[in-house]
Interface confidence: medium
């Protein structure tokens, strides 16, 4: 297993609809044909997998239909979008990139993107 640098933004604020997007960029040392991207969430020293997808270079990134993540890939950049976020989902979202094939296997883990989610205030009742 060889190390690889992964860069991602330090902070992202989710939209009022609970959607957060960020770019995960990796420094590919070789010509990989298969890349696996995993988003991990770290909160209160607990790390959980949010979503994962493997894609082929030159092809678009697809997560499974029931995933809360969507994404696109372009060269060594992956544009990730996480939906359905609520205030309780605030935390550090870490991008993990693996160059699966061909050998050698490379692994890179970003420093994480702190995603802040603020639940929208309920609309006040109106007589109008």
């Amino acid at each position: 297993c060889k190390a690889m640098h992964v860069a991602q933004p330090a902070v992202v604020l989710a939209s009022s609809r609970g959607i957060a997007s960020f770019v995960c960029e990796y420094a590919s040392p070789g010509k990989a044909t298969e890349v696996r991207v995993t988003v991990l969430r770290q909160a209160d020293s607990q790390v959980t997998e949010v979503c994962a997808a493997t894609y082929m270079m030159g092809n678009e990134l697809t997560f499974l239909d029931d995933s809360i993540c969507t994404g696109t890939s372009s060269g060594n950049q992956v544009n990730l979008t996480i939906q359905g976020l609520r205030a309780m989902d605030t935390g550090l979202y870490i991008c993990k990139v693996e160059l699966m094939y061909p050998p050698p296997y490379y692994l890179g883990i970003g420093n994480g993107t702190q995603i802040y989610v603020i639940d929208p205030e309920p609309c006040p009742d109106s007589d109008f």
Epitope: E34, A52, T54, M56, N59, E60, T62, L64, Y101
Partner: nanobody, 115 residues
Framework: EVQLLESGGGLVQPGGSLRLSCAAS????????MAWYRQAPGKGLELVAG???????NYVDSVKGRFTISRDNSKNMVYLQMNSLRAEDTAVYYC?????????WGQGTLVTVSS
């Protein structure tokens, strides 16, 4: 775990056609990409074609316009239609399944292009 079983290989004359099939079983719900690789005698593995869960395809330059990859999600199958075959297409063809936690290979099927 995902299991893959290829079929359809054989001997064909230059300019001929073959259709390879790959049947997936097991945890197929976790597959979001399927592909065909090949290994020619004395050479390394080469990605031939791939298709994702939305049906988007990609091909290595040497087979563009001759090979077509397709996927039938209802039957858990992926196909490789190979037309205008050349001697340099002779290889063992392997099916590949990829997902968030899945990376499976088939056992391979031999394609020989010779007159």
């Amino acid at each position: 775990e995902v299991q893959l079983l290829e079929s359809g290989g054989g001997l064909v004359q230059p300019g001929g056609s073959l259709r390879l099939s790959c049947a997936a079983s097991g945890s197929i719900f976790s597959i979001n990409h399927m592909a065909w690789y090949r290994q020619a005698p004395g050479k390394g593995l080469e990605l031939v074609a791939g298709v994702n869960s939305r049906g988007t395809t990609n091909y290595v330059d040497s087979v563009k316009g001759r090979f077509t990859i397709s996927r039938d999600n209802s039957k858990n199958m992926v196909y490789l239609q190979m037309n205008s075959l050349r001697a340099e297409d002779t290889a063992v063809y392997y099916c590949r399944a990829l997902g968030g936690a899945v990376a499976a290979w088939g056992q391979g099927t031999l394609v020989t292009v010779s007159s």
